[in-house]
């Protein structure tokens, strides 16, 4: 559950984030799992740890393997695993499936292609973009911050898009490339006021103290690709990241699904090792888009162990 796949190309920079997160003040130790050998923090090393980040500058095929990160606080330790694979550069233009990031869909109204993982790097604009290995040129293509915007999208715009940027570390530059597929949706989509499918308003969820619990916030927003649609969790009206309880984490990516043709988003809130004080919190599921926002609240209650005595 707390394992994450990461991949990169040899001789490029690769930065991996620990799948377990905590406050910035917590220390994070990294180990190479096979040997249990500690990853150094000194930046003079080609591979070094920097808090929640593990940096390969540059990466080598031999770096492939499983890395362990341990988030340490005064009261607990949390362990995560990063499964890193470094591939040799391809001589031909085809990008194999195992190097592809998640596919994104676009339509005439919404044609943003985000450069995957770029937020982990110290880069400066502009990004370079390629489609099927050809540099993108012309006024229809606009590199804006960390994404590419395509004007007047057509079905021919579908394909594999690669972003290329330079990561700077202490004055040294390293190249990074990332590729994802872009598909063009032809259907006439529409957008609705968010409808929260789960949880029900004022739902009570039974949990067991000491066990893990998952809460899912699920909402639908219309048909087709949705712009500015989001679902998120809050604790007592506070963002999860600001609440500062490492046991309670929001799943990083939002899962998009299509239910009865409707575009829906799910966000899972994971509560590790449920404690008594968690029962006092209000868990708010927010769904928002261009039309408006809606809120549902969940509370936790203690699940009584089944009495086996006759």
């Amino acid at each position: 559950k707390f394992s994450k796949q990461s991949w990169g190309l040899e001789n490029e920079a690769l930065i991996v984030r620990c799948p377990r997160q905590g406050k910035p003040s917590y220390t994070v130790d990294w180990y190479y799992s096979q040997t249990n050998k500690s990853i150094p923090t000194q930046e003079r090393n080609r591979v070094f740890a920097s808090g929640q980040l593990l940096k390969f500058l540059p990466a080598a095929v031999a770096d492939s393997g499983i890395y362990t990160c341990i988030v340490r606080s005064p009261t607990f330790n949390r362990t995560g695993y990063a499964n890193v694979t470094i591939y040799k550069k391809q001589s031909d233009c085809n990008v194999p499936d195992y190097l592809m990031y998640s596919t994104v869909s676009g339509s005439e109204k919404n044609s943003k292609i985000y450069c995957p993982t770029i937020d982990l790097y110290n880069w400066t604009a502009p990004l370079e973009w390629f489609k099927n290995c050809q540099a993108l040129q012309g006024s229809r293509y606009r590199a804006h911050k960390s994404f590419l915007v395509i004007d007047n999208v057509m079905t021919e715009d579908a394909g594999d898009y690669t972003c290329k940027f330079i990561h700077n570390e202490n004055g040294a530059n390293y190249s990074v490339t990332a590729t994802r597929s872009f598909t063009v949706k032809d259907e006439q989509g529409f957008s609705l006021f968010p409808v929260i499918g789960a949880p029900a308003q004022n739902e009570i969820k039974e949990v067991e103290i000491g066990k893990n619990a998952n809460l899912t916030c699920s909402a639908c927003f219309g048909k087709g690709t949705q712009f500015l649609a989001a679902v998120l969790w809050q604790l007592n009206g506070t963002k999860i990241t600001d609440f500062g309880e490492p046991r309670i984490q929001q799943e990083e990516g939002q899962n998009q699904s299509f239910s009865n043709g409707l575009a829906c988003l799910d966000m899972v809130l994971r509560i590790a090792d449920v404690k008594e004080e968690d029962l006092l919190l209000q868990y708010d599921c927010l769904a928002l888009n261009l039309h408006g926002l809606r809120r549902h609240t969940v509370r936790l209650s203690r699940k009584n162990p089944i009495d086996h005595h006759s």
Epitope: N202, L228, D242, G292, L293, T297
Partner: antibody, heavy 117, light 107 residues
Framework: EVQLLQSGGGLVQPGGSLRLSCAAS????????MSWVRQAPGKGLEWVST????????YYADSVKGRFTISRDNSKNSLYLQMNSLRAEDTAVYYC??????????WGQGTLVTVSS | DIQMTQSPSSLSASVGDRVTITCRAS??????LAWYQQKPGKAPKLLIY???TLQSGVPSRFSGSGSGTDFTLTISSLQPEDFATYYC?????????FGQGTKVEIK
């Protein structure tokens, strides 16, 4: 103590424009959602508009949609309401307020907008 | 849009009285309800949020209850400074909507 200081009200002719400002202090403005609420003379409160901390999300009452624009400048800790095509029924005291999860926990002192020829 | 209906629209009471104001939503809003107090010429002041949570600094004689569609604001022992107009507001979904207000006057 959280403070919201408003400015920019006044008398304007029907069809005219006006820009209201709200200067915030003593809280992390860039993280806060903000709202505008108005109150016509002798009447109740009416929500006008809300903006998220990053300006990504903006919402409006149907009565002002297409005429009013909410915006913010986080570098100046300031919230704005640009009001165009003003009508007599827009005459009201306008309040800016911090929006904490939909509840409006701190309010500006209010500024009177009068639309009249 | 969600309609909020307050009752009564006005009431007369004496210092020390127990006062109850009700607010009804046109649909289930869970606990997403706030209560405000407004005095003439002043900005509204938040009293209660999430239907029953007392805002910091508000006297404990104010309390809120209810869930779903029916909500109540209670002032256990009315004080001279409590004579004002009270509004409920839903934040379940945009557009946020207010009740029409209840004016509490001196008997």
């Amino acid at each position: 103590e959280v403070q919201l200081l408003q400015s920019g009200g006044g008398l304007v002719q029907p069809g005219g424009s006006l820009r209201l400002s709200c200067a915030a202090s003593e809280f992390t403005f860039s993280n806060a959602w903000m709202s505008w609420v108005r109150q016509a003379p002798g009447k109740g409160l009416e929500w006008v508009s809300t903006i998220s901390g990053t300006s990504r999300y903006t919402y409006y009452a149907d009565s002002v949609k297409g005429r009013f624009t909410i915006s913010r400048d986080n570098s100046k800790n300031s919230l704005y309401l640009q009001m165009n095509s003003l009508r007599a029924e827009d005459t009201a005291v306008y309040y800016c307020a911090r929006d904490q999860d939909g509840r409006l926990d701190y309010w500006g002192q209010g500024t009177l907008v009068t639309v009249s020829s | 849009d969600i309609q909020m209906t307050q009752s009564p629209s006005s009431l007369s009471a004496s210092v020390g009285d127990r006062v109850t104001i009700t607010c009804r939503a046109s649909q289930n809003i869970g606990s997403w309800l706030a209560w405000y107090q407004q005095k003439p010429g002043k900005a509204p002041k938040l009293l209660i949020y999430r239907a029953s949570t007392l805002q910091s600094g508000v006297p404990s004689r104010f309390s809120g209850s209810g869930s779903g569609t029916d909500f109540t604001l209670t002032i256990s022992s009315l004080q001279p400074e409590d004579f004002a107009t009270y509004y409920c507001q839903q934040s379940y979904s945009t557009p946020y909507t207010f009740g029409q207000g209840t004016k509490v006057e001196i008997k």
